[in-house]
């Protein structure tokens, strides 16, 4: 029961995590205009992995896609790649884990196969979560670096009469969604790996056991009698562990001239 619960919970947690990774990847708020200790503007800028947006105080929002591939910073491309790899691995992991779930019967799939699939999906979830966390962290690091660079520029002499205020960007909601989602996927993956240990048949449990009959010496090995209660092919489906018994079970909106905020 505990194996099923661990596996099921791992699946659900990973599913939520991957949904979060997808959401974070599609979100526009990876970086948002820093409003603290900055000249306050009537325009709010925010950027995602795929497009940048501007929201006016009028309520008008305009988003523009990054229609270039070569002109984008290498770091942004790297973050995109990490997030996509995370999503792909997570999606495959989910697919594999569905078939690995103990509560789902697929033909005569043996527990050893389910254990392997559970482990595979667990590893995929772990890598997926790590990819998301890495992607978000790389982007966050990029923001921190740019933030302090633009802060330095703001306070050094510009020269000339005209001041230009550089827009500084800080962490957007997508970063926090990404971190949490990556963490959940990672936790789900670990849970799947733990569940895998409970599914794997313990070969040392029932090695050849000799029964000495009074008249002649005959060795009965597991699998010898299909109808036997403790042995036979059933051993693969029923396992007893030291820990206790376990049984099966992501534009534009336009304000109308007649519609005001």
């Amino acid at each position: 029961m505990a194996v099923t619960a661990c596996q099921g919970l791992g699946f659900v947690v990973s599913l939520i995590g991957i949904a979060g990774i997808i959401a974070a990847t599609c979100m526009d708020q990876w970086s948002t205009q820093d409003l603290y200790n900055n000249p306050v503007t009537a325009v709010f800028n925010y950027q995602g992995l795929w497009r940048s947006c501007v929201r006016e105080s009028s309520g008008f929002t305009e988003c523009r896609g990054y229609f270039t591939l070569l002109g984008l910073p290498a770091m942004l491309q790297a973050v995109r790649a990490l997030m996509i790899v995370g999503i792909v691995l997570g999606a495959i992991g989910l697919l594999v884990s569905i078939f690995a779930l103990k509560c789902i019967r697929i033909g005569s799939m043996e527990d050893s196969a389910k254990a392997n699939m559970t482990l595979t999906s667990g590893i995929m979830f772990i890598v997926s979560g790590l990819c998301a966390i890495a992607g978000v962290s790389v982007f966050a690091n990029m923001l921190v670096t740019n933030f302090w660079m633009s802060t330095a520029n703001m306070y050094t002499g510009m020269g000339g009469m005209v001041q230009t205020v550089q827009t500084r960007y800080t962490f957007g909601a997508a970063l926090f969604v990404g971190w949490v989602a990556g963490g959940l996927t990672l936790i789900g993956g670990v849970m799947m790996c733990i569940a895998c240990r409970g599914l794997a048949p313990e070969e040392t449990n029932y090695k050849a056991v000799s029964y000495h009959a009074s008249g002649h010496s005959v060795a009965y090995k597991p699998g010898g009698f299909k109808a036997s209660t403790g042995f036979g092919s059933n051993t693969k489906n029923k396992k007893i562990y030291d820990g206790g018994a376990r049984t099966e079970d992501e534009v534009q909106s336009y304000p109308s001239k007649h519609d005001y905020v």
Epitope: P39, A42, N45, S58, T167, P255, K257, Y260
Partner: antibody, heavy 117, light 113 residues
Framework: QVQLVQSGAEVKKPGASVKVSCKAS???????VHWVRQAPGQGLEWMGE????????NYNEKFKKRVTMTRDRSTSTVYMELSSLRSEDTAVYFC???????????WGQGTLVTVSS | DIVMTQSPDSLAVSLGERATINCKSS????????????LTWYQQKPGQPPKLLIY???TRESGVPDRFSGSGSGTDFTLTISSLQAEDVAVYHC?????????FGGGTKLEIK
């Protein structure tokens, strides 16, 4: 027809307060409404803005201590109250509705406030 | 605060001639996010509220005659009336719609020569 209709002219004594109203008709009362004043023969001066949806407001620092902007959603009316009036507050006060580019597409007809002892 | 400096203070132009009004801001009004300049032009006739002519420095408001055009970027902007008509006699104001507090230029009085 889109209209912002303001209250009538007021004559106030120095130190008093004035409350000017701006009633919106012809459109949904949801967007920021701004207040701008114009002293006789002078340029335009932005005083602040109010969001009728949530009553959030932003004020020009120059008027922050003296101005209060409120709204009554039931009557689609916004109010601008200016306290501690001085003679230099004599001006025409306009309310304006915001549009693309944070520009002011619709204006009230203006309310003349005269501060005189 | 952002200072908006309009020039000239007053301008006399013959009917049918070109009128040019300049506006300079103390900080750039260009928003890098959408590459739009948050500068607006208004026309104000005596005893009337201002009328929106141009927003985003060059986008003409619907119903505004095409003889009115706006140009410029960053800190320097221009309002041009290609062929002055009698009804264009008014005061023209430029406005910073980017930084709070939103500020206006001193106005340019346009008259017929």
């Amino acid at each position: 027809q889109v209209q912002l209709v303001q209250s009538g002219a007021e004559v106030k004594k120095p130190g008093a307060s004035v409350k000017v109203s701006c009633k919106a008709s012809g459109y949904t009362f949801t967007n920021w409404v701004h207040w701008v004043r114009q002293a006789p023969g002078q340029g335009l001066e932005w005083m602040g803005e109010i969001n009728p949806t949530n009553a959030r407001s932003n004020y020009n620092e120059k008027f922050k201590k003296r101005v209060t902007m409120t709204r009554d959603r039931s009557t689609s009316t916004v109010y601008m109250e200016l306290s501690s009036l001085r003679s230099e507050d004599t001006a025409v006060y306009f309310c304006a509705g915001i549009y693309y580019g944070n520009s002011f597409a619709h204006w009230g007809q203006g309310t003349l406030v005269t501060v005189s002892s | 605060d952002i200072v908006m400096t309009q020039s000239p203070d007053s301008l006399a132009v013959s009917l049918g001639e070109r009128a040019t009004i300049n506006c300079k801001s103390s900080q750039s009004l260009l928003n890098a996010g959408n590459q739009k300049n948050y500068l607006t032009w208004y026309q104000q006739k005596p005893g009337q509220p201002p009328k929106l002519l141009i927003y985003w420095s060059s986008t003409r408001e619907s119903g505004v005659p095409d003889r009115f055009s706006g140009s410029g970027s960053g800190t320097d902007f221009t309002l041009t009336i290609s062929s002055l008509q009698a009804e264009d006699v008014a005061v023209y104001h430029c406005q910073n719609n980017y930084y709070y507090p939103l500020t206006f230029g001193g106005g340019t009085k346009l008259e017929i020569k």
